[in-house]
């Protein structure tokens, strides 16, 4: 029985050109995490394997950095990075847990109503 839950950073708004950190945390289970995949719209961004470490997809190598922890840092954001991101936790013996984070990237000039976008 899968008892775990995934907590995420929550949905994020960020400005074009900035950086953001996507993070998920698996709790309420003793299952062993064997691999975490980060995906966007059916595209694989990165893999963190418990034995083999990190692999960043070649097409994202210049803008995606591993970590912190099992999270992912997206740099030099463009409007085209707007979309839903998935952290997929492969665990034993539970199976797969998925977390979802939506990122909206805004042109700097259109940040409406003085929103606070904290870019790390």
């Amino acid at each position: 029985m899968m008892t775990g839950t995934i907590e995420t950073t929550g949905n994020i708004s960020a400005e074009k050109g900035g950086s953001i950190i996507l993070q998920c945390h698996l709790s309420s289970t003793t299952a062993q995490v064997t691999q975490v995949n980060w995906e966007q719209q059916d595209q694989l961004l990165a893999i963190c394997n418990a034995d083999l470490g990190w692999h960043i997809s070649p097409s994202f190598k210049d803008r995606v950095a591993p970590g912190p922890g099992l999270g992912l840092t997206l740099q030099s954001l463009t409007v085209n990075d707007t979309g839903e991101y998935f952290c997929i936790y492969h665990t034993y013996p539970d199976g797969t847990y998925t977390g979802r984070i939506f990122l909206e990237v805004l042109e700097s000039s259109v940040a409406e109503h003085g929103a606070r976008f904290q870019i790390p």
Epitope: T8, T9, G10, N11, I12, S13, I20, I21, Q23, Q41, V79, N80, T82, G83, E84, R100, I101, F102, E104, L106, V110, A111, E112, H113, A115, R116, F117, Q118
Partner: antibody, heavy 119, light 112 residues
Framework: EVQLQQSGPELVKPGTSMKISCKAS????????MNWVKQSHGKNLEWIGL????????SYNQKFKGKATLTVDKSSSTAYMELLSLTSDDSAVYFC????????????WGQGTSVTVSS | DVVLTQTPLSLSVSFGDQVSISCRSS???????????LSWYLHKPGQSPQLLIF???NRFSGVPDRFSGSGSGTDFTLKISTIKPEDLGMYYC?????????FGPGTKLEVK
Amino acid sequence: EVQLQQSGPELVKPGTSMKISCKASGYSFTGHLMNWVKQSHGKNLEWIGLIIPYNGGTSYNQKFKGKATLTVDKSSSTAYMELLSLTSDDSAVYFCSRGLRGFYAMDYWGQGTSVTVSS
Amino acid sequence: DVVLTQTPLSLSVSFGDQVSISCRSSQSLVNSYGNTFLSWYLHKPGQSPQLLIFGISNRFSGVPDRFSGSGSGTDFTLKISTIKPEDLGMYYCLQGTHQPPTFGPGTKLEVK
């Protein structure tokens, strides 16, 4: 003036599919997310999903995956929602709504499209 | 999914009254950057829902200042300082911090 004009009411048969349109005007269509919301029994509101007109990306409520398909036609500034394999549970009013940039809120709404599924 | 609980579910008011509607979330609506995506809507019969408040406390353009929003974390409140006839209808809170976005069950504001 921002406007979202939806297609008219529909009476459809169970098992069929149908498509609702939402024509946007008065703003840059590709600059805002477009949401779809279901209102059942004149009360409960449920988020179905959203589409990113800029790149066609989508995000769905898992409950509606396989039930709703969202698309856009940038040339006509129109968003579409196709509802598949309709049952009586799909009888509802459906709204499109524009995303308020940066706040995950919905600032302008269409007038709603009433869908009745009946044989 | 995040569950939003609104109280009360219905309110009978007289014009000129002040009312408060509560919206409680099953988990914190603060994201990792300190932003809270909680908004309030009024849905009048036969009309489209209209945005009143976004980001907890920001009034949307054209919304009268008798409407105010407050709260943090999991507890949020919409206050209407002086009820007018055009304020009658269903009030909904919406959280946009976690996927999928979820609405509260609604609070019906009607005249006594």
